[in-house]
């Protein structure tokens, strides 16, 4: 009689993760009689799949009827696959005895189990950083197999270039996980931007998966300063106002100081927004001319963000002679904005507070 | 190992029925037909009928179609033969046997129940 | 139905010759190449023991002084050389359709 063949006709076997995997056996010959084993893996660690013969095997089915007669298909169905089900699967062949005696083992089908990344989780840096200033985001999808899958990282539609990705393990696993980080300049003009993560991968079938951050989150952008007298008004009061332009966030306070003396502090909320996600801010104070002999320092100074302190000073020029209605008191801007330049201009709705 | 487990003996009135058990017992039990066998005292051998324990598909020998009726309990990892309106005629042992190889053979045997029919 | 007939329905053979028990078939009992043809062995006061299987093939732990030849309607069990141990009746059993048995083959050893 010609000897007995243990046929595994397919030397690999690709199945997406939840499916169920067909693993196909036939033997050439009814003899010798004695049952069939499926096991995962070779040698003595090999791990017990399906025995025809006995156990309970809840996930494995045989595809062939077994009590049907002359029956040669050992075929199994594994239901409800998971990355944990990879592995080389063995069909073996035993002879009926007591006990039964391992005769023939199948050349084996490797079965890989192709599982979708999961979806990518951008984070940005723990605290805000300035505009003009270089920061990290990360990227982590988990889960996928095989190995090979793509990511991308895109501002604004324009893909980045400062990036570095790792694909963890480097060796063989059941599946996979990969972390990316992107550096990112932030310019005044990234409130509104947003930063996102792209990844293919085969079990996606061209539709990546996509994960955002706002840039919003990340970023601040300190204000312009800029402090204005107004003309004299008729009973000698002078006008003087603090604009605060194009900051973010809104956490912002405001203290005006009379010769260094604290006079009125404010804190900035419900600002409208102007188009590129920042805030305006103006602060007036009323000085009364006539209550002063000397020249009057006022000082408005603003805290951004817990952010230290930003100063702009102006010297209110007292004159010895009476004011005349309506004219213009002498006066000398002494101070410096020391974020950017005075003369920004903004032609945005301005948010005016009024004090007498 | 393979184990069919089968009562000694049933005595029973004629006219009345019996219900034969074999327990089966270190296989997988829907995946093996079980048959049913016949032999009077100093005789031969009878295949009566086999059942297969997963859905229960039976199949007889004529001669005993209105004699024996086959069922199985899957739970309990056996299978019954009932004998109906019994005579002299049917004392015997009545062995089950597990056909191991899907061949339509009987490769392990119970003990067998010795069936006294007597008044 | 296939009709088996066994013959001799008796044997005596001394110890170490050779005992020969024939089956025949009332139509061919192969099909796909193989013969559905089982020799089993039984004691008094036992079951029944498979024997050989399809024709030739020894069961698991039968010993090789046991063999099983034929094909077709014709089929032989020998066994050589006889041991005492091997005082029993034989019988042959098909399943080319649903079994049927023969009528046994009671060996005695002189």
């Known amino acids: 009689e010609e000897e007995l063949q243990v046929i595994q006709p397919e030397k690999s076997v690709s199945v997406a993760a939840g499916d169920s995997a067909t693993l196909n056996c036939t033997v050439s010959s009814l003899i010798p009689v004695g049952p069939i084993q499926w096991f995962r893996g070779a040698g003595p660690g090999r791990e017990l799949i399906y025995n025809l013969k006995e156990g309970h095997f809840p996930r494995v089915t045989a595809v062939s009827d077994p009590t049907k007669r002359n029956n040669m298909d050992f075929s199994i169905r594994i239901s409800n696959i998971t990355p944990a089900d990879a592995g080389t699967y063995y069909c073996v062949k035993f002879r009926k005895g007591s006990p039964d005696v391992e005769l023939k083992s199948g050349a084996g089908t490797e079965l890989s189990v192709r599982a979708k990344p999961s979806a990518p989780v951008v984070s940005g840096p723990a605290v805000r950083a300035t505009a003009e200033h270089t920061v990290s985001f990360t990227c982590e999808s988990h889960g996928f197999s095989p190995r090979d899958i793509t990511l991308k990282w895109f501002k604004n539609g324009n893909e980045l270039s400062d990036v570095q990705t790792n694909v963890d393990p480097a060796g063989k696993s059941v599946s996979y996980s990969i972390r990316s980080t992107a550096r990112v300049l932030l310019t005044r003009r990234d409130v509104h931007s947003q930063v996102i993560c792209e990844v293919a991968h085969v079990t996606l079938q061209g539709d990546p998966l996509r994960g955002t951050a706002n840039l919003s989150e990340a970023i601040r952008v300190p204000p312009f300063l800029e402090v204005t007298q107004q003309s004299m008004r008729a009973d000698n009061q002078v006008n003087v106002t603090c604009q605060v332009t194009k900051f973010y966030p809104q956490r912002l306070q405001l203290t005006w100081l009379e010769n260094g003396n604290v006079s009125r502090t404010e804190m900035a909320s419900a600002l409208p927004e102007n188009k590129d996600g920042t805030y305006n801010w103006t602060s007036w104070l009323l000085v009364n001319v006539s209550a002063h002999r000397d020249d009057v320092k006022l000082t408005c100074q603003v805290e951004h963000d817990g952010q230290p302190a930003v100063n702009k000073s102006f010297s209110v020029k007292v004159s010895a002679h009476p004011k005349e209605q309506g004219s213009n008191t002498a006066a000398e801007n002494t101070g410096t904005n020391e974020r950017g330049s005075s003369d920004y201009k903004d032609d945005d709705d301005k948010h005016h507070h009024h004090h007498h | 190992q393979v184990q069919l487990q089968q009562p000694g003996t049933e005595l029973v009135r004629p006219g009345a029925s019996v219900k034969l058990s074999c327990k089966a017992s270190?296989?997988?039990?829907?995946?093996?037909?079980i048959n049913w066998v016949k032999q009077r005292p100093g005789q031969g051998l009878e295949w009566i009928a086999m059942?297969?324990?997963?859905?229960?598909?039976?199949h007889y020998n004529q001669i005993f179609k209105d004699k024996a009726t086959l069922t199985v309990d899957k739970s309990s990892n056996t299978a019954y033969m009932q004998l109906s309106s019994l005579t002299s005629g049917d004392s015997a042992v009545y062995y089950c046997?597990?056909?191991?190889?899907?061949?339509?053979?009987?490769?392990?045997w119970g003990r067998g129940t010795s069936v006294t029919v007597s008044s | 139905d296939i009709v088996l007939t066994q013959s001799p329905a008796s044997l005596a053979v001394s110890l170490g010759q050779r005992a020969t028990i024939s089956c025949r078939a009332s139509?061919?009992?192969?099909?796909?190449?193989?013969?559905?043809i089982f020799w089993y062995q039984q004691k008094p006061g036992q079951p029944p023991k498979l024997l050989i299987y399809?024709?030739?093939n020894l069961d698991s732990g039968v010993p090789a002084r046991f063999s099983g030849s034929g094909s077709g309607t014709d089929f032989t069990l020998n066994i050589h050389p006889v041991e005492e141990e091997d005082a029993a009746t034989y019988y042959c059993?098909?399943?080319?359709?649903?079994?049927?048995f023969g009528g046994g083959t009671k060996l005695e050893i002189k």
């Open positions: 139509k061919s009992v192969s099909s796909s190449g193989y013969n559905y």
């Open positions: 059993q098909h399943s080319r359709e649903l079994p049927t």
């Open positions: 399809l024709a030739s």
């Open positions: 059942i297969d324990p997963s859905d229960s598909e039976t």
């Open positions: 270190g296989y997988t039990f829907t995946n093996y037909w």
């Open positions: 046997a597990m056909d191991y190889g899907s061949l339509y053979a009987m490769d392990y």
